[in-house]
């Protein structure tokens, strides 16, 4: 049975050119993590697995870093990294949990003449 | 000014698919997520998912996986979404609804469907 | 998927009157970065729902300034100062920090 839950950073908005840091964690379980995959929509951005290390997929390389700890920093923000991001950790003897993030990122010009957030 | 103009209300068939527009107008499509609504019993609002018109990418609530399917014509500023294989439970109104920072900031007027035979 | 909690579930009101409602969700709506995506809905018979509140207590633009909105973590209220005939309907919060967004049951603010 699958007791485990995953939380993650939350959705995320950000400005293009920024950088931001994709995080999930799973919990509430005692199952083991073999491996965490990086997603977005179909294509794979990233690999963790705890015997191999990181594997960053070579079309995400220059934009993509490992870290901090089984997250994923995405760099040189464009337009086109908006949409929904999934976590997937593979667990022994559980199996698969998912976690969904989603990243909208945003024009200066959108982002300064749309609906803002007072700084406090 | 911002507007989302929603295609009129459907009175179609159980088991039939039918797709409900959403043309945008007055701001650069391209820069905003659409959304989509469903509201039962005129009461109960209930998030279906989201396209991002720029790449085309979506976003759906598992419980409308394989109910609903996104698309955008990005050369006549439209949204559209199909819902597949309707029932009863499908009768409602649905809304189109432009996202800023993860807030619903423009509507559409809403389309009903009715499912009956 | 986050549950959020709307109270009351009907208010009956007084025009002039304070009131406020309750939205409480699930689990935190503050993201990683300490930003919170809560926002606030009126709902009008026979038009589409409008943005009131954006960011927890950022008000919409060509939104009256006796709407505020307040509050953090999971525990968030939504106060209108003077209650006017243009105020009544269906109120809804809305949380978009965690996938999927999910709206709270609504609160009717009707005429005593």
């Known amino acids: 049975m699958m007791t485990g839950t995953i939380e993650t950073t939350g959705n995320i908005s950000a400005e293009k050119g920024g950088s931001i840091i994709l995080q999930c964690h799973l919990s509430s379980t005692t199952a083991q993590v073999t491996q965490v995959n990086w997603e977005q929509q179909d294509q794979l951005l990233a690999i963790c697995n705890a015997d191999l290390g990181w594997h960053i997929s070579p079309s995400f390389k220059d934009r993509v870093a490992p870290g901090p700890g089984l997250g994923l920093t995405l760099q040189s923000l464009t337009v086109n990294d908006t949409g929904e991001y999934f976590c997937i950790y593979h667990t022994y003897p559980d199996g698969t949990y998912t976690g969904r993030i989603f990243l909208e990122v945003l024009e200066s010009s959108v982002a300064e003449h749309g609906a803002r957030f007072q700084i406090p | 000014e911002v507007q989302l103009q929603q295609s009129g209300p459907e009175l179609v068939k159980p088991g039939a698919s039918m797709k409900i527009s959403c043309k945008a107008s007055?701001?650069?499509?391209?820069?905003?997520?659409m959304n989509w609504v469903k509201q039962s019993h005129g009461k109960n609002l209930e998030w279906i998912g989201l396209?991002?018109?720029?790449?085309?990418?979506?976003s759906y609530n598992q419980k409308f996986k394989g109910k609903a399917t996104l698309t955008v014509d990005k050369s006549s500023n439209t949204a559209y979404m199909e819902l597949l294989s309707l029932t009863s439970e499908d009768s409602a109104v649905y809304y189109c609804?432009?996202?800023?920072?993860?807030?619903?900031?423009?509507w559409g007027q809403g389309t009903t469907l009715t499912v009956s035979s | 998927d986050v549950v959020v909690t709307q109270t009351p579930l009907s208010l009956p009101v007084s025009f002039g009157d304070q009131v406020s409602i309750s939205c409480r969700s699930s689990?935190?709506?503050?993201?990683?970065?300490?930003?919170?995506?809560l926002s606030w809905y009126l709902h009008k018979p026979g038009q589409s729902p409008q943005l009131l509140i954006y960011?927890?207590?950022n008000r919409f633009s060509g939104v009256p300034d006796r709407f505020s909105g307040s509050g953090s973590g999971t525990d968030f209220t939504l106060k209108i100062s003077t209650v006017k005939p243009e105020d009544l309907g269906m109120y809804y919060c809305?949380?978009?920090?965690?996938?999927?967004?999910?709206f709270g049951g609504g609160t009717k603010l009707e005429i005593k």
């Open positions: 609804a432009r996202s800023l920072r993860f807030s619903f900031d423009y």
């Open positions: 007055g701001y650069s499509f391209t820069g905003y997520i």
């Open positions: 396209i991002v018109p720029n790449n085309g990418g979506t």
């Open positions: 689990q935190s709506l503050a993201n990683s970065y300490g930003t919170t995506y």
């Open positions: 960011g927890i207590s």
């Open positions: 809305l949380q978009g920090t965690h996938q999927p967004p999910t």
